[in-house]
Each structure stands twice: as structure tokens, then as C-alpha cells.
């Protein structure tokens, strides 16, 4: 976990002010509106059944 303004989060994660820690970019498929997703290069779309089973 990284504090903002220090070393960046590890590859595949991005800083979340809401969570106060680095968060997994993979989570952006499920939680695309999370603040940290803005820092993730590409949030892949959710499979159809995950959102609307």
C-alpha cells in the first residue's frame, strides 16, 4: 500500500482516496465508477452475465 505522493502503486493497481490504499485495477470490471479506476489504463467491460445474470 502506498501513500499518495510517494512511490506509485504497483503494476495493475491504482491509488484510491476513498479506500486510502492502492486498489486492484481488475476490480474496475465490477466497480467501474470507483475513484481509482480513473488511474487504470483500461477497465475491461464486464461479461454480460456478471452484470445481468
Amino acid at each position: 500500500e502506498q501513500a499518495p505522493g510517494t512511490a506509485p502503486c504497483s503494476r495493475g493497481s491504482s491509488w484510491s482516496a476513498d479506500l486510502d490504499k492502492c486498489a486492484d485495477c481488475a476490480s474496475c470490471r465490477a466497480r467501474p465508477h470507483s475513484d481509482f479506476c480513473l488511474g487504470c489504463a483500461a477497465a475491461p467491460p464486464a461479461p454480460f452475465r456478471l452484470l445481468w445474470p
Epitope: 495493475g12 476513498d18 479506500l19 486498489a23 486492484d24 485495477c25 481488475a26 476490480s27 470490471r29 465490477a30 466497480r31 465508477h33 483500461a42 475491461p44 461479461p47 452475465r49 456478471l50 445474470p53
Partner: antibody
Framework: EVKLEESGGGLVQPGGSMKLSCVAS????????MSWVRQSPEKGLEWLAE??????????HYAESVKGKFTISRDDSKSRLYLQMNNLRAENTGIYYC??????????WGQGTTLTVSS | DIVLTQSPASLTVSLGQRATISCRAS??????????MQWYQQRPGQPPKLLIK???NLDSGVPARFSGSGSGTDFTLNIHPVEEEDAATYYC?????????FGGGTKLEIK
């Protein structure tokens, strides 16, 4: 310290109903997806139901095996999760875990409450 | 539904050695970027505990002797060096779609 505490388990006759409760503390309950997971010797770990956030209009999802029989709900003001179970059968016997996850995994688990369906 | 098959069902590993547990999914649970597979540890009488999310990402507080790898349909949990406290049952779980499913578990014993 994160804590999830289930209650409401016990012995119920086949065809009966039961409502499980779970009270959460130590994390921002209203920002976490919540689920119920059952464990039994016969079927191992089974995800049963999930409820998402207010911003998702509290969307719910169920395993086929419990769809129409179980209802998951939450009360964010009380940091509580519920599972209403109707028309219970022997195969619903097991340990019921309350779980919370920021997304599509289970970060936090309660100690579980045991449900026994038997005559 | 996606079926997760774990192997072996049980294994015994000497203290300090490597434990390797496999999980095979009946269909791919990966995109080009991420894999939607988790690993949990369950000690006797306790609930499961999240170890690894998205195939490779260690949960906070989990010792670095645990590692996850794999993509597509084949995933692996490695523990090295194994310690006495690692005696437990380990489960994989996918989050590719609903319903989420778990593997049948692998019981690890330490000698």
C-alpha cells in the same frame, strides 16, 4: 478490527422457514458487496446470494439452487445483512457464512452460523 | 456454471519445502489483462480467509511465501517455504460470472 457476526441458525423442520442475520463492524459496510456462502460436507463451499450497493439499486443475484426460495437484503443504517430462507429442505443444512467484498471476491468472513434441517 | 477442479485433493509437504496446488476451470476466466480467480485458506474450525485475488495479487497481511500464478483455465497456488501454520484446506474461487463457484478444496498437511 473487521467483524461479521451471524445469528439465527438452529434446527428447523423440512418445509419450514428461517431468517439469518449478520451484523458488521470495522469497515464501511455501505461500500461493500455482501454475500451469503454455505459450507456442507456434501457440497463444500457454495455461494448462495449477493446484494450490491445503494448506487446499484441494491441489485441482488442468486444461485439457481436457492432462487425463489431465499431472499437477501441489507440495512445500511444498521450495518446488517439478512437471508430469509423458505421451504427449507435437508440439503440446505450447513454452515452459513456472511461475507463482504469490495468487488467480486470475499474479503471478510464471519464465523458462521449452523442451520440443520431435519424432522 | 463454471466448474473448478482442484488437485491434488490432499498433499503432505515437509516443513520448509514447497507446496503446489492446482485449480482448473471448465472455461477461461481471464481477459487479456486480468484473471478472475481467487485463493482462500481455511484452517480447521475457522472461516475461509482471502489469500490471493485476481490470480496473482496477495491480499494485505498475507505472507510473501504465498504466490499465485496462471491464466485462462489453469491456475496455481504456491507456498514456499511451508510453515506449520499453513496446515489448512485451500480453495480456489472464480469471479468471471455469476454464479461464483469454488473448487472442492485441497487439504495441506505438514510433516
Amino acid at each position: 478490527e473487521v467483524k461479521l457476526e451471524e445469528s439465527g441458525g438452529g434446527l428447523v423442520q423440512p418445509g419450514g422457514s428461517m431468517k439469518l442475520s449478520c451484523v458488521a463492524s470495522g469497515f464501511t459496510f455501505n461500500n461493500y458487496w455482501m454475500s451469503w456462502v454455505r459450507q456442507s460436507p456434501e457440497k463444500g463451499l457454495e455461494w448462495l446470494a449477493e446484494i450490491r450497493l445503494k448506487s446499484d439499486n441494491y441489485a441482488t443475484h442468486y444461485a439457481e439452487s436457492v432462487k425463489g426460495k431465499f431472499t437477501i437484503s441489507r440495512d445500511d443504517s444498521k450495518s446488517r445483512l439478512y437471508l430469509q430462507m423458505n421451504n427449507l429442505r435437508a440439503e440446505n443444512t450447513g454452515i452459513y457464512y456472511c461475507t463482504g467484498g469490495f468487488a467480486d471476491y470475499f474479503d471478510y468472513w464471519g464465523q458462521g452460523t449452523t442451520l440443520t434441517v431435519s424432522s | 456454471d463454471i466448474v473448478l477442479t482442484q488437485s491434488p485433493a490432499s498433499l503432505t509437504v515437509s516443513l520448509g519445502q514447497r507446496a503446489t496446488i492446482s485449480c482448473r476451470a471448465s472455461q477461461s476466466v481471464s481477459t487479456s489483462s486480468y484473471s478472475y480467480m481467487q485463493w482462500y485458506q481455511q484452517r480447521p474450525g475457522q472461516p475461509p480467509k482471502l489469500l490471493i485475488k485476481y490470480a496473482t495479487n496477495l491480499d494485505s497481511g498475507v505472507p510473501a511465501r504465498f504466490s499465485g500464478s496462471g491464466s485462462g483455465t489453469d491456475f496455481t497456488l504456491n507456498i514456499h517455504p511451508v510453515e506449520e501454520e499453513d496446515a489448512a484446506t485451500y480453495y480456489c474461487q472464480h469471479s468471471w460470472e455469476i454464479p461464483y463457484t469454488f473448487g472442492g478444496g485441497t487439504k495441506l498437511e505438514i510433516k
